[in-house]
Interface confidence: medium
């Protein structure tokens, strides 16, 4: 069964900035990625980036940069503008669509006692919505 | 069904704002973006600008910055585009699109448009 | 910015007839383009997205082909209410730009 992993990296330097990992496990190509933060896709989540792999990318603030890792994972650097960090207690889901397989949803936040620079194990903590 | 409802005709004088409404309906404005289209009588279709009404964070083509301010209401789905320092150039149908990111990348559904005159 | 080059400004034909029209874009935008038809005092309704795909309800008649810098929207078997404006827009590229448009004239 495919897989989706999700790390969210609170960055050492910067404490305002935090970088979203996405990965897919399994076979097949993927036709778009799409992550969300505050739910899942169409779920009360809203987009921050979507990645496809011949169109390019699109993100929206507070998404600073988004970009392919390899060809089936991805990262979204983030940029926390306000003096809290709302990012902190916030989920974040990656979506990727995948030809033949159809599309699998992961969320993922940061740990609560999380240090900078450490980051949330790859917790795949599937929701299962195979569309 | 998807449908974009736009405001009523705008009658402005040159120098003055108006501010343009795009009501969706059946879907969540959270989850496309919106883009506006500018078309004057008898010309081709030019391109404003687009809000991703979930994060607040508008693109302007660069002709319209400072002309044009696109801004939403998620709770009442509703889009809008505030046009200032009116001049005759502006007289022209404004038109909101749904820009969709899952299959389509560009804009798929389209409102009726808005006419906007700048007369003194 | 991306220019869109439509370069025929108005054409015309025939019902029944097959149509072709054309859009080249300044440089490679993929399959980044969409076409979309304009009837007289209406708004713009999509057509093709992504190259060659048809948006939901759109007769076969209409067919999209084309990818880099070279697009082309055609119409077989034309009818009458085919009469409209025919844009190509590229979004591979912020911002996004519109070909001048083709005016379809019906014989």
């Known amino acids: 069964t495919p897989e989706v992993w999700v790390q969210v990296q609170m960055e050492a330097t910067e404490l305002s900035s935090f970088t979203v990992h996405c990965g897919f496990l399994g076979p097949g190509s993927i036709s778009l990625v799409t992550v969300s933060w505050g739910g899942p896709d169409g779920a009360g989540g809203t987009k921050l980036a979507v990645l496809h792999p011949e169109l390019g990318t699109r993100q929206w603030a507070p998404a600073r940069q988004a970009r392919w890792e390899t060809q089936s994972s991805i990262s979204l650097a983030l940029e926390d503008s306000g003096a809290s960090s709302p990012f902190a207690n916030t989920t974040f889901c990656c979506k990727f669509a995948s030809f033949p397989e159809g599309s699998w949803e992961s969320c993922g936040s940061l740990p609560p006692s999380s240090d900078p620079g450490l980051s949330a194990p790859p917790t795949p903590v599937p929701i299962l919505r195979a569309d | 069904q998807v449908q974009l409802q736009q405001s009523g005709p705008e009658l402005a004088r040159p120098g003055a704002s108006v501010k343009l409404s795009c009501k969706a309906s059946g879907y969540t404005l959270t989850s496309h973006g919106i883009s506006w289209v500018k078309q004057r009588t008898g010309q081709g279709l030019e391109w404003i600008g687009e809000?991703?009404?979930?994060?607040?964070?508008?693109y302007y083509s660069e002709k319209f910055k400072g002309k044009a301010t696109l801004t939403a209401d998620k709770s009442s789905n509703i889009a809008y585009m505030q046009l200032s320092s009116l001049t005759s150039e502006d007289s022209a149908v404004y038109f909101c699109?749904?820009?969709?990111?899952?299959?389509?990348?560009?804009?798929?559904?389209w409102g009726q448009g808005t006419s906007v005159t700048v007369s003194s | 910015d991306i220019v869109m080059t439509q370069s025929q400004k108005c054409m015309s034909t025939s019902v029944g007839d097959r149509v072709s029209i054309t859009c080249k874009a300044s440089q490679n935008v993929r399959s980044a383009v969409a076409w979309y038809q304009q009837k007289p005092g209406q708004s713009p309704k999509t057509l093709i997205y992504?190259?060659?795909n048809r948006h939901t309800g759109v007769p076969d008649r209409f067919t999209g082909s084309g990818s880099g810098t070279d697009f082309t929207l055609t119409i077989t078997n034309v009818q009458s209410e085919d009469l409209a404006d025919y844009f190509c827009?590229?979004?591979?590229?912020?911002?996004?730009?519109f070909g001048g448009g083709t005016e379809l004239e019906i014989k």
């Open positions: 809000i991703y009404p979930g994060s607040e964070s508008p």
């Open positions: 992504l190259a060659s």
């Open positions: 827009l590229q979004h591979w590229n912020y911002p996004w730009t």
């Open positions: 699109a749904r820009s969709d990111y899952s299959d389509y990348w560009a804009m798929d559904y």
